[in-house]
């Protein structure tokens, strides 16, 4: 079951998933000037059996200028620099990932992929929050959000995190102990997360839903 809305926005914070539940989809998005190859899948899908999970399909991008070719275009110096940054980040993300049954790791980057990754999360997915550079984390409980199914609808739990002040950035789970507290949080206003929304509003009783597409920005 796909989660219908996006994880909560926390001011001056970004989120990431340490691992992706089976059923998660990742759009095959290409950077400007490139497009998905004609025979290519529109998304990667986290699938698996009892012992192993992996991403089905591979994303491939080709130059929009190229007509009937699937040849990978050599990136220009600017693009190479951008791609290297993405690779480095991906490797860093993989380094702190544990192998969870029924979960896939962060997929490695593909040639000429877009700078934003658009994930479609499923019920049971957990995402973790950290404050952006220059903001300090005030924990009032777990700095995480879980997609749950209740009331016939999906929702994300509220992460117990506030990002404040000018100081060192906080860390992801395992690198800092949050202080637990039962208090709730006020609604957050803005976020550096890039999100695109695709509204599918149904106002009938049993289906008052909104569908959002999730995007996390590479920092």
């Amino acid at each position: 079951e796909l989660c219908d809305d996006d994880p909560p926005k926390i001011t001056h914070a970004t989120f990431k998933a340490v691992a992706y539940k089976e059923g998660t989809m990742l759009n095959c998005e290409c950077k400007r000037g490139f497009r998905r190859i004609k025979s290519g899948s529109p998304y990667m899908l986290c699938t698996g059996n009892s012992s192993h999970s992996s991403w089905d399909n591979q994303c491939q991008c080709t130059s929009s200028a190229a007509r009937n070719t699937t040849k990978q275009v050599t990136p220009q110096p600017e693009e190479q620099k951008e791609r290297k940054t993405t690779e480095m980040q991906s490797q860093m993300q993989l380094a702190d990932q544990v192998s969870l049954p029924g979960h896939c790791r962060e997929p490695p980057p593909w040639e000429n992929e877009a700078t934003e990754r658009i994930y479609h999360f499923v019920v049971g997915q957990t995402v973790y929050y950290q404050c952006v550079q220059g903001y300090r984390a005030l924990h009032r409980g777990p700095a995480e959000s879980v997609c749950k199914m209740t009331h016939g609808k999906t929702r994300w739990t509220q992460p117990q995190l506030i990002c404040t002040g000018e100081t060192e950035p906080s860390q992801f789970p395992g690198e800092e102990e949050p202080q637990a507290s039962p208090d709730g949080l006020p609604e957050s206003e803005t976020s550096r997360l890039v999100t695109t929304t695709d509204f599918r509003i149904q106002t009938e009783v049993a289906a008052t839903m909104e569908t959002f597409i999730f995007t996390t920005e590479y920092q």
């Epitope: 749950k148 199914m149 009331h151 016939g152 609808k153 709730g184 509003i201 009783v205 008052t208 909104e210």
Partner: antibody
Framework: QVQLQQSGPGLVKPSQTLSLTCAVS??????????WNWIRQSPSRGLEWLGR?????????DYAVSVKSRISINLDTSKDQFSLQLNPVTPEDTAVYYC??????????WGQGTLVTVSS | EIVMTQSPATLSVSPGERATLSCRAS??????LAWYQQKPGQAPRLLIY???TRATGIPARFSGSGSGTEFTLTISSLQSEDFAVYFC?????????FGQGTRLEIK
């Protein structure tokens, strides 16, 4: 501390409109992490959920099938109030009516309850 | 709609003893189940949500268990203030439903 304070008449004539209001303090009705509900309780029906209103970038209402054609839940965000209208009513609508907050888990805060008698 | 059935309708237990109340759903409600306590003239009070999580301020003698269609509320050592009516409620479906209640009385 969240509090829900109910108000409204305790006696309504058959075929007329039952109207109750629930004033919220300690929270906002526009809180995206909660839904605002009406529930009633009678010896014959037990506890019966009637409907909810909630905000998810716009306002939504969900109504129980048993009362869908007769119920309306409205909001006054400036006063942090929500209200119940049930029209028309019959003696079978005689019950104690409660408003309650639901943070998408269970009803954690309830109003004090209002006994509404439908009788001519 | 999901029908919630509680048993027994009335349970007689002596103070200090353990009370076990059951709730069955007509179809799976996952762990989306709550328990309430109600005393005469009062609104229901939330005891347990998510099948097994105690609400704020609820004593540790109250515990919930189960998932899917079978659920249990256990009161480990009954206090005089625990004698009341107990309701289960599912919130898995968009249309919320309650059980008919179990009256817990002093034996």
């Amino acid at each position: 501390q969240v509090q829900l304070q109910q108000s409204g008449p305790g006696l309504v004539k058959p075929s007329q409109t039952l109207s109750l209001t629930c004033a919220v303090s300690g929270d906002r009705v526009s809180n995206i992490n909660a839904a605002w509900n009406w529930i009633r309780q009678s010896p014959s029906r037990g506890l019966e959920w009637l409907g909810r209103t909630y905000y998810r970038s716009k306002w939504y209402n969900d109504y129980a099938v048993s009362v869908k054609s007769r119920i309306s839940i409205n909001l006054d965000t400036s006063k942090d109030q929500f209200s119940l209208q049930l029209n028309p009513v019959t003696p079978e609508d005689t019950a104690v009516y409660y408003c309650a907050r639901d943070p998408w888990e269970a009803f954690d805060y309830w109003g004090q309850g209002t006994l509404v008698t439908v009788s001519s | 709609e999901i029908v919630m059935t509680q048993s027994p309708a009335t349970l007689s237990v002596s103070p200090g003893e353990r009370a076990t109340l059951s709730c069955r759903a007509s179809q799976s409600v996952s762990s989306n189940l709550a328990w309430y306590q109600q005393k005469p003239g009062q609104a229901p009070r939330l005891l347990i949500y998510a099948a097994s999580t105690r609400a704020t301020g609820i004593p540790a003698r109250f515990s919930g268990s189960g998932s899917g269609t079978e659920f249990t509320l256990t009161i480990s050592s009954l206090q005089s203030e625990d004698f009341a009516v107990y309701f289960c409620q599912q919130y898995n479906d968009w249309s919320i439903t309650f059980g008919q209640g179990t009256r817990l009385e002093i034996k």
